[in-house]
């Protein structure tokens, strides 16, 4: 499975979209987990709503939000207020009982904001409303680069 590299600016939001075959993964919850080491386990960060028919509702754990468009086959994860410690290897997973199928591997890289060393002035980053927005996860304000490369053996 190829690894997608996503870069986000510290302090901003990074949006990750993992696409999947909607029919194949029908009825399955999705999860976002963080890989602990190259061969280590993947530690669950957040998963979609426990009721699959409500998977489009945003579920949050700390600064990470997940929502699943089950009809379109896209699960969206938003990492808010990105910090250096958020950098690392993650997975989008499809859950089936106790089994987890990897949909996508994502390497998150955090770039230091050059404004951190200067006076940020009146820079304003919009906060997401907590109101119901269904599958409409807000667009990331970060500058994303998306490249794929084959996994190293």
């Amino acid at each position: 499975l190829n690894t997608t590299v996503l870069q986000g600016m510290a302090g901003q939001s990074l949006r990750v979209s993992c696409t999947y075959d909607a029919l194949k993964h029908w009825g399955r919850r999705k999860a976002w987990c963080r890989q602990l080491g190259e061969e280590g386990p993947c530690q669950r960060v957040v998963s979609t709503h426990g009721v699959w028919l409500l998977a489009f509702l945003k579920k949050r754990n700390g600064s990470t939000v997940i929502a699943d468009d089950t009809l379109a086959g896209t699960v969206t994860i938003t990492l808010k207020n990105l910090q250096a410690g958020d950098a690392g290897l993650y997975q989008c997973q499809s859950l089936r009982g106790r089994e987890a199928e990897v949909l996508q591997k994502v390497l998150v890289e955090v770039l230091e904001d050059p404004l951190d060393d200067q006076d940020a002035g009146d820079l304003w980053v919009p906060e997401e409303s907590s109101s119901f927005e269904g599958a409409q996860v807000e667009h990331s304000t970060s500058r994303n680069q998306e490249t794929s490369f084959p996994p190293t053996s």
Epitope: W26, G50, W52, L53, F56, L57, L71, S130, S131, F132
Partner: antibody
Framework: EVQLVESGGGLVQPGRSLRLSCTAS????????MSWFRQAPGKGLEWVGF??????????EYTASVKGRFTISRDGSKSIAYLQMNSLKTEDTAVYYC?????????????????WGQGTMVTVSS | DIQMTQSPSSLSASVGDRVTITCQAS??????LNWYQQKPGKAPKLLIY???NLETGVPSRFSGSGSGTDFTFTISSLQPEDIATYYC????????FGGGTKVEIK
Amino acid sequence: EVQLVESGGGLVQPGRSLRLSCTASGFTFGDYAMSWFRQAPGKGLEWVGFIGSKAYGGTTEYTASVKGRFTISRDGSKSIAYLQMNSLKTEDTAVYYCARGKRRDYGYWHPAFDVWGQGTMVTVSS
Amino acid sequence: DIQMTQSPSSLSASVGDRVTITCQASQDITNYLNWYQQKPGKAPKLLIYDASNLETGVPSRFSGSGSGTDFTFTISSLQPEDIATYYCQEYDQYLTFGGGTKVEIK
């Protein structure tokens, strides 16, 4: 006029089966998720289960106490939602309501229920 | 499972009074909460969804607020037709209702 009408309630012995119907009119039935709720005499409301809109192909979810005993289905051609209740217990005695989930513009639904039927009484007793 | 605790279980107020009902969730449910009104012998009626959004056609004297674990439902000026039992309902985990609050006129 948007309307839901339940039918099929009555007195039934424990262990037996009963099928409730919820006939919809005044709206495009297939575009909405439908849910069943119940209310035991003098008690509060309890969610029983729901079925997704046509786009979800009849996908259902149930509360733990009825899972494996109750089945929700829908007939789009007749605009009817059904609640098939098997292995009934005395604790299933209640008024059963069907309700429509709110619809959002972008095609998803909302688990707030904006149209309700008048209810049908189910009594499980020997 | 999430527990929804509604209080008070009943209250008596005069016409024109401000009435407040609270609903407390056993864990954070963000704003995934609805409020319903049920008059005796009738089906429930949706009043508020997403904790604070007024359903179409519902009088503006009804309002809701809160997020996380603590929610409030308010009738700004109680009317005789508001005699009913009011229920909160979460949808963060399943669809769990509070125990209800019966509102009567003094």
